[in-house]
């Protein structure tokens, strides 16, 4: 069944003399391998032979015979599936049919194939999207329906006869569907390609000229202008007249329509390629240029900048920055419209002409308070001087300056005052508006600027104060001088170092810890009784009877102090003994009789002795010797010694008589 | 050509006083703010007194304020320095001196004039 | 009130470069001028605004002044730059005008 057999390849191939030519062929039989193989030229089928005539190019049989042709055509393909042939070279008289007559066991088919060859190389074509504008990217074609391996080719992009700098890219296909080799170039065509020729050109491998094909581009785009002004250097003074011309170099498709903008903005009722400005005004200064519109937009021509000239006009000046701290940098621009620019300036401050600077800037790296004012000027051109405008207003700021303190109080303040005191300055800006004090204290402010110390310290020594703006000035702190009466008056013993001792030298010493003013009296009294003026007490010799309780005065203009009481204490051996009796130095025997050592002593006495008539020392060591009951033989003397830290002291003699009691007479 | 000549100078006894002047040329006068600086003998530069082009603004060094009067005549080109209740340590060159508004510097000086107390 | 301190004087030899200086606190923030004067002659303006030089000034002339230091540099000293050299401020706080007390620049 010979619908079984299936075929594919390029319907037509196409080469010319000497080339070569690739067939692409692919095939199926379905009822096994192939077993034998012809390739004819023109083939035509003899009925009365039931065989095909025509020229034999290649025969591939079971015996293996091949004609002399073999080696000019190739049969590149198998036994079921590839049918691809090769000629190489191709010859003008190859062009026709190509009949591939195939055989298997049981099947046999005829593929035809047409091959057209041409004389001399064939041009490619060149294909063109149907429209191209300027500066939009296109991409050219140039196709050529043939590709063989055998036969390497190019083509190459040319732009009124010389080779285009873009890239193209080359492609080829040598497949059952398609054989052709192709070039891609990218291009972004300007206004000035319109009417170009382009062409792609067919070349070997050694770049001989092969064949072309040619095309003429049609770039379409807006008016390309040209622009013509009298003067030729569009500069003019107000009052001169001015004429632009507007030239169309080129236009596809034709222009419509003409206007004139100025500054970007169409100028009204000016439709003709001719614009005539008569006595011109600075105003008409600008970038003029003409538009021209056609299909595809407006063109514009190139900008024509008309500078009509005039003397300055009133300046204006603008201070970068107001309000200035003092010591900060400022600058002052002098801006005043005019044509040519301004040559030189004349500062002026306060109204009055600031000499050494005629620049357009002034810069001042550190302001200084006198530049604080207004500031004006004048610009001047070739053509005149201008007019002084408003002037700006520069504001320095600083901190308070020469901030003092000040007492309102009379002097001298004492102790106990209310104080008063203000904060001054010289001069300050902005306004001042807080004060600070040191130290801090719960202290009045009645004002701004006035602190009120009520009971004023003895100690509030120095204060200072600040006034404030955006910055605080401190001023030096005052002294205040409180005037106060002497401060911890003590009585202290200078010598001995050691206690005190009866006949001992000693020194006692008034002490205060300050006094303002300085100068001071000394006081020394002993109950109530004034004893001296120094501010020492010296004893050359102490005795008991100056112990007690002492105070020191001390005083000043201010008023006086007294110290705590302080208690003189002198040590002495035990002094003025004495032994007395009791119930008295007469006694009943069978009583009870006490004896008293009765004693003066500092400290007072640690240890008793007790002695009778015949100083023998009792066996009691008490202050109190009791005799209970007392006998007749207790008569006699009696004496005591005491001891203490300081020394031993002894009584004199106390005579202590017992009597009879009447019982004991009555027995005798 | 910028040009500052004082006068005015001389011998005065402590307590008495003196007026310094100081003729100003070459330049707008009425424009500058001007100075006086004086320089005891064999010492330093101490500045004295400052006054601006329209004399509203006068500034005095604490040595001499409340005795010594800056003052200035536009009209006459003249600049003065009236001193009362001179001292010993008065004495030196009193220098007429130029201010460049802009900077505070001193641009120009005169020769100076000796006052000797 | 404020004060200027500058060495009282500086020796160079000839062709080198002489460095006076003058303290201050916070100077770097007030506008420096420095003055030359020669013996028996007036002051005259050699450096202002920190560092700006009057015309008539040579170029070996400079200044420059930051944190605490202002700086008066002489370069390839030459005898005729022998002279008093004195630096002064603007103090704003006293309104006042402040001079340096003086260097003296002795050329070897």
């Known amino acids: 069944d010979s619908s079984k057999w299936v075929f594919e390849h390029p319907e037509t191939l196409y080469a010319w003399e000497g080339a070569c030519v690739w067939i692409p062929c692919t095939y199926r039989a379905l009822d096994g391998d192939l077993e034998s193989f012809i390739l004819f030229h023109n083939p035509e089928y003899n009925k009365n032979t039931s065989k095909f005539d025509g020229t034999r190019l290649y025969e591939s049989t079971k015996d293996g015979k091949v004609p002399s042709e073999q080696k000019r055509v190739q049969f590149l393909g198998d036994k079921n599936k590839n049918c691809t042939l090769s000629i190489h070279p191709v010859h003008l008289n190859d062009s026709g049919q190509l009949g591939l007559r195939m055989e298997s066991k049981t099947e046999k088919w005829m593929e035809r194939i047409h091959l057209n060859v041409s004389e001399r190389p064939f041009p490619p074509h060149i294909q063109l999207p149907p429209e191209i504008q300027e500066s939009q990217e296109v991409t050219l074609t140039c196709l050529l329906n043939f590709s063989c391996y055998g036969y390497p080719i190019q083509l190459q992009w040319l732009l009124e006869g010389v080779p285009m700098r873009q890239a193209a890219v080359t492609s080829t296909s040598l497949t059952i569907k398609s054989v052709f080799t192709r070039s891609e170039l990218k291009f972004s065509p300007q206004w000035s390609h319109h009417g170009k020729i382009v062409t792609c050109q067919l070349q070997d491998a050694d770049g001989k000229f092969l064949s072309n094909d040619t095309v003429q581009l049609n770039v379409k785009h807006t008016p390309k202008l040209e622009i013509k002004v009298t003067p030729s250097d569009a500069i003019v003074r107000e009052g001169d007249s001015v004429t632009m011309t507007c030239e169309v170099s080129s236009s596809n498709p034709e222009y419509t329509t003409v206007s004139w903008l100025k500054d970007g903005t169409s100028l009204k009722k000016q439709n003709t390629f001719t614009l005539n400005l008569r006595e011109v005004t600075k105003d008409q200064s600008g970038k003029y240029c003409c538009q021209v519109s056609n299909d595809v937009g407006p063109g514009r021509s190139e900008e024509v900048f008309l500078q009509v000239q005039y003397a300055p006009e009133p300046s204006t000046v603008q201070i970068l920055h107001s309000p200035a701290v003092e010591g900060s940098q400022v600058e002052f621009l002098c801006m005043s419209l005019a044509n040519p620019l301004p040559t030189n300036y004349t500062w002026y401050h306060n109204g009055k002409e600031m000499q050494g600077r005629t620049e357009e800037k002034v810069h001042i790296p550190k302001i200084l308070p006198w530049h604080a004012g207004t500031y004006s000027c004048v610009a001047e051109n070739i053509l005149g001087t201008g007019q002084r405008g408003p002037g700006a207003e520069l504001d320095v700021q600083y901190p308070p300056k020469k901030v003092t303190t000040v007492i309102q109080n009379p002097m001298p303040i004492r102790e106990g005052d209310t104080v008063t005191l203000s904060c001054n300055y010289n001069s300050s800006n902005p306004s001042v508006t807080r004060y600070e004090w040191k130290p801090h204290g719960a202290w009045e402010e009645p004002s701004l600027g006035v602190l009120k110390i009520q009971n004023v310290g003895w100690d509030n020594t120095t204060i200072a104060c600040a006034a404030c703006n955006s910055w605080c000035s401190w001023a030096s702190p005052v002294a205040l001088n409180v005037q106060y009466a002497p401060r911890d008056v003590r009585v202290r013993k200078i010598k001995p170092l050691s206690e005190i001792h009866s006949g001992n030298s000693v020194s006692l010493q008034c002490d205060f810890s300050s006094s303002h003013p300085k100068e001071v009296q000394f006081f020394w009294e002993k109950n109530g009784r004034l004893l001296g003026k120094e501010s020492q007490l010296n004893f050359d010799s102490i005795s008991p009877e100056d112990a007690g309780s002492y105070s020191c005065w001390v005083n000043n203009s201010i008023g006086q102090t007294a110290s705590k009481a302080w208690t003189l204490e002198v040590l002495y051996a035990p002094r003025r003994l004495r032994v007395s009796m009791s119930p008295g130095d007469q006694v009943m025997e069978g009583k009870s009789a006490t004896l008293t050592c009765e004693s003066d002593a500092n400290p007072p006495v640690s240890h008793y002795t007790w002695f009778d008539w015949n100083n023998q020392s009792l066996p009691y060591h008490s202050q109190k010797l009791r005799l209970e009951p007392v006998k007749v033989q207790h008569s006699g003397a009696y004496w005591c010694q005491g001891t203490n830290s300081v020394g031993k002291g002894r009584s004199p003699l106390s005579t202590l008589t017992v009597y009879y009691s009447p019982e004991t007479i009555g027995r005798r | 050509e910028v040009q500052l000549v004082e006068s005015g100078g001389g011998l005065v006894k402590p307590g008495g006083s003196l007026r310094l002047s100081c003729a100003a040329s070459?330049?707008?006068?009425?424009?500058?703010?001007m100075s006086w600086i004086r320089q005891a003998p064999g010492k330093g530069l101490e500045w004295v007194s400052y006054i601006s082009s329209s004399g509203s603004t006068i500034y005095y060094a604490d040595s001499v304020k409340g005795r010594f009067t800056i003052s200035r005549d536009n009209a006459k080109n003249s600049l003065y320095l009236q001193m009362n209740s001179l001292r010993a340590e008065d004495t030196a060159v009193y220098y007429c001196?130029?201010?460049?508004?802009?900077?505070?510097?001193?641009?120009?000086w005169g020769q100076g004039t000796l006052v000797t107390v | 009130s404020y004060v200027l301190t500058q060495p009282p004087s500086v020796s160079v030899a000839p062709g080198k470069t002489a460095t006076i200086t003058c303290g201050g606190t916070n100077i770097g923030s007030k506008n420096v001028h420095w003055y030359q004067q020669k013996p028996g002659q007036a002051p005259v303006l050699a450096i202002y605004y920190d560092s700006d030089r009057p015309s008539g000034i040579p170029e070996r002339f400079s200044g420059s002044n930051s944190g605490n230091t202002a700086t008066l540099t002489i370069s390839r000293v030459e005898a005729g730059d022998e002279a008093d050299y004195f630096c002064q401020v603007w103090d704003s706080s006293s309104d006042h005008w402040v001079f340096g007390g003086g260097t003296k620049l002795t050329v070897l």
């Open positions: 001196a130029r201010d460049d508004f802009w900077s505070g510097s001193v641009d120009y």
């Open positions: 070459g330049f707008t006068f009425s424009d500058y703010y």
